[in-house]
């Protein structure tokens, strides 16, 4: 499965649009700092496409979801967040025909589960940060900086997964 | 491979303007904020300020506030350092150093060569 | 402002010995930083985050402490490590660094 040369600019227009959606002065938000234990190595080169599109569509599965509760609602640009959602959307449909094509039917489903759940945690994780800090604005740029940090990394393992072939 | 590349030393005179520059390479100029430290003959680190290249916010030590101006050009991934009137006090050793802002990462973890810094009547 | 207040200001020691650098914060923080500083050269990065080692930072030195108090601790000293250590909180603007603790051969 290829995934289309729009695939890469909507990945890097969400990334603008994360930019973008930034409110307050980062400065102030530095004491709430946090490790949110990004998954890297569910992320690394030694994946197979056919193991790495369940991996990524569930990355941004799990973005769309985050962003698109009511206290995401209140904490961001209503028109920059219908802009992200339609990207996200978008990626989404492209990674959904991959699987739907079978890519990855012949791989041991165990590590894709693995994969899939790691990723899961780690939203997990942020979710009950945003919760614990009362989705306060810095707790939500902190969040927004995390997963610009972590889109990137995976965009960037789409990118070397294109080179590869 | 990470780079900071700091512009040359520099010789003014007290009362003269000087902008120093600071230019990024291997990593994504944008995602990280530059510090700037000063260190005076023989003496040790002062945080001066920093800026985040996205958008150009600045915050800066309560001791350089209004004595330096902070800045960035993101199409050139360069960050300077500038004074509109420099004094013989000025006279130091300059690092820039890169932070990850907001993020879980090391804090200035690559640093400039750092310019020195000469100001002589 | 946070002050970094560090301690001793200069020691003396002699390779293979173990070292002790201490930092303590004017108040609560959760975030830091250990430097390396030789003659002529910028700043190294040597632990983060109170006691995370920075990558290819030799094993020998490690962090520890929370809240105000902060160690660093050289193992067993190599002659590569005379040079000036300084410690930095990166908990809040503005960052504030400790004064330095210079380590000489004896």
């Known amino acids: 499965c290829d995934l289309p040369q729009t695939h890469s600019l909507g990945s890097r227009r969400t990334l603008m649009l994360l930019a973008q959606m930034r409110r307050i002065s980062l400065f102030s938000c530095l004491k709430d700092r946090h490790d949110f234990g990004f998954p890297q190595e569910e992320f690394g080169n030694q994946f197979q496409k056919a193991e790495t599109i369940p991996v990524l569509h569930e990355m941004i599965q799990q973005i769309f979801n985050l962003f698109s509760t009511k206290d995401s609602s209140a904490a961001w640009d209503e028109t920059l967040l219908d802009k992200f959602y339609t990207e996200l959307y978008q990626q989404l449909n492209d990674l959904e025909a991959c699987v739907i094509q079978g890519v990855g039917v012949t791989e041991t489903p165990l590590m894709k589960e693995d994969s899939i759940l790691a990723v899961r945690k780690y939203f997990q994780r942020i979710t009950l940060y945003l919760k614990e800090k009362k989705y306060s604005p810095c707790a939500w740029e902190v969040v927004r900086a995390e997963i610009m940090r972590s889109f990137s990394l995976s965009t960037n393992l789409q990118e070397s997964l294109r080179s590869k072939e | 491979e990470v780079q900071l590349v700091q512009s040359g030393a520099e010789v003014k005179k007290p009362g003269e303007s000087l902008k120093i520059s600071c230019k990024g390479s291997?990593?994504?100029?944008?995602?990280?904020?530059i510090g700037w430290v000063r260190q005076m003959p023989g003496k040790g680190l002062e945080w001066m300020g920093i800026i985040d290249p996205s958008d150009s916010d600045t915050a800066y030590s309560p001791s350089f506030q209004g004595q330096v101006t902070i800045s960035a050009d993101k199409s050139i991934s360069t960050a300077y350092l500038q004074w509109s009137s420099l004094k013989a006090s000025d006279t130091a050793m300059y690092y820039c150093?890169?932070?990850?802002?907001?993020?879980?990462?090391?804090?200035?973890?690559?640093w400039g060569q750092g310019t020195l810094v000469t100001v002589s009547s | 402002d946070i002050q970094m207040t560090q301690s001793p200001s200069s020691l003396s020691a002699s390779v293979g010995d173990r070292v002790t650098i201490t930092c303590r914060a004017s108040q609560s923080i959760n975030n830091l930083n250990w430097y390396q500083q030789k003659p002529g050269k910028a700043p190294k990065l040597l632990i983060y985050?109170?006691?995370s080692l920075q990558s290819g930072v030799p094993s020998r030195f490690s962090g520890s402490g929370s809240g105000t108090d902060f160690t660093l601790t050289i193992s067993s000293l190599q002659p590569e490590d005379f040079a000036t250590y300084y410690c930095q909180q990166g908990y809040d603007t503005p960052f504030t660094f400790g004064q330095g603790t210079k380590v000489e051969i004896k």
């Open positions: 150093a890169r932070h990850p802002g907001l993020n879980w990462a090391p804090d200035f973890d690559y």
């Open positions: 291997g990593y994504s100029f944008t995602s990280y904020w």
């Open positions: 985050w109170a006691s």
